[in-house]
């Protein structure tokens, strides 16, 4: 392991569309990748009238947008589908939304996913 970097070897896995995609619904996913490439975890979710609906969680391939992020945080302003990525085992267990564009102090609380 490289000092100062959280290596990602496994991520929380969840797929709301598991039947159609023919996957498990939930579990732990081992992350694979090429030598010299980093691995990450991700979470995607929707906010439907204030209710959080997780879409997918799992491993994410080498992506500079995720480098050195120990927390899974979506910073885009009001996306249709929320997406965050992070480094470190199971770092996608919790995810949150803190839009960068907001002038006022964000009021979002971290979301701890609960599979439906």
């Amino acid at each position: 392991a490289i000092l100062g970097r959280s290596e990602t070897q496994e991520c929380l896995f969840f797929n709301a569309n598991w039947e159609k995609d023919r996957t498990n619904q939930t579990g732990v996913e081992p992350c694979y990748g090429d030598k010299d490439k980093r691995r990450h975890c991700f979470a995607t979710w929707k906010n439907i009238s204030g209710s959080i609906e997780i879409v997918k969680q799992g491993c994410w391939l080498d992506d500079i947008n995720c480098y050195d992020r120990t927390d899974c945080v979506e910073k885009k302003d009001s996306p249709e589908v929320y997406f965050c990525c992070c480094e470190g085992n199971m770092c996608n267990e919790k995810f949150s939304y803190f839009p960068e564009m907001e002038v006022t102090q964000p009021t979002s609380n971290p979301v701890t996913p609960k599979p439906p």
């Epitope: 090429d34 010299d36 490439k37 991700f42 995607t44 879409v55 997918k56 799992g58 491993c59 994410w60 391939l61 080498d62 992506d63 500079i64 947008n65 885009k76 996306p79 249709e80 589908v81 929320y82 997406f83």
Partner: antibody, heavy 115, light 111 residues
Framework: QVQLVQSGAEVKKPGASVKVSCKAS????????INWVRQAPGQGLEWMGT????????SYAQKFQGRVTMTRDTSISTAYMELSRLRSDDTAVYYC????????WGQGTLVTVSS | QSALTQPASVSGSPGQSITISCTGT?????????VNWYQQHPGKAPKLMIH???KRESGVSNRFSGSKSGNTASLTISGLQAEDEADYYC???????????FGGGTKLTVL
């Protein structure tokens, strides 16, 4: 092994639209981006845009904004690139590539725009 | 984002070393280690050779190496071989909040 297989060559008239598909296999489709790149005959590579395969979020090169639409169907691990209002200078080979580093490429799809 | 600048052509004899440059600005090449190098043979799809300035892809010969100084990234090919004759492109990472851009390409001729 990772493979990106693209749809076949297309001949279109100016003003028409074309939709190119890119079917991924050998990895988890929803674990990265799909980028689209084109190459006009005898010219260099030109980045068109990218789609996050899990969220569907897109970013397009300014040049193609308003004319290009990138979508995906996660159930069949396939990404699509649709280019509308075709002109003769859109004649090119269109490639899809995996991830932000473009580490695997499709074989290319020749789109010819001619009246 | 404007295109990265590459020489149109370079040449070298078998066994020699050549270097291809890729010049950007302080806000792209100069700021980040996100430059990649691709090899493209005629009629074929490009192939990623080096990502993140200097990391060789698995299966790529160690005759290929990448480096960066200031706003210029470079690809060096040592011990030139006939099969190295191809077009070479530099490009940046693309995805999320990063937009892609390529250099104009460099035609390498092995004499």
């Amino acid at each position: 092994q990772v493979q990106l297989v693209q749809s076949g060559a297309e001949v279109k008239k100016p003003g028409a639209s074309v939709k190119v598909s890119c079917k991924a296999s050998g990895y988890t489709f929803t674990s990265s981006y799909i980028n689209w790149v084109r190459q006009a005959p005898g010219q260099g590579l030109e980045w068109m845009g990218t789609i996050n395969a899990v969220s569907g979020s897109t970013s397009y090169a300014q040049k193609f904004q308003g004319r290009v639409t990138m979508t995906r169907d996660t159930s069949i691990s396939t990404a699509y690139m649709e280019l509308s209002r075709l002109r003769s200078d859109d004649t090119a080979v269109y490639y899809c590539a995996r991830g932000g580093w473009f580490d695997y490429w499709g074989q290319g799809t020749l789109v010819t725009v001619s009246s | 984002q404007s295109a990265l600048t590459q020489p149109a052509s370079v040449s070298g004899s078998p066994g020699q070393s050549i270097t291809i440059s890729c010049t950007g600005t302080s806000s792209d090449v100069g700021s980040y280690d996100y430059v990649n190098w691709y090899q493209q043979h005629p009629g074929k799809a490009p192939k990623l050779m080096i990502h993140g300035v200097s990391k060789r892809e698995s299966g790529v010969s160690n005759r290929f190496s990448g480096s960066k100084s200031g706003n210029t990234a470079s690809l060096t090919i040592s011990g030139l071989q006939a099969e190295d004759e191809a077009d070479y492109y530099c490009g940046t990472f693309a995805g999320g909040s990063y937009y892609g851009v390529f250099g104009g390409g460099t035609k390498l001729t092995v004499l």
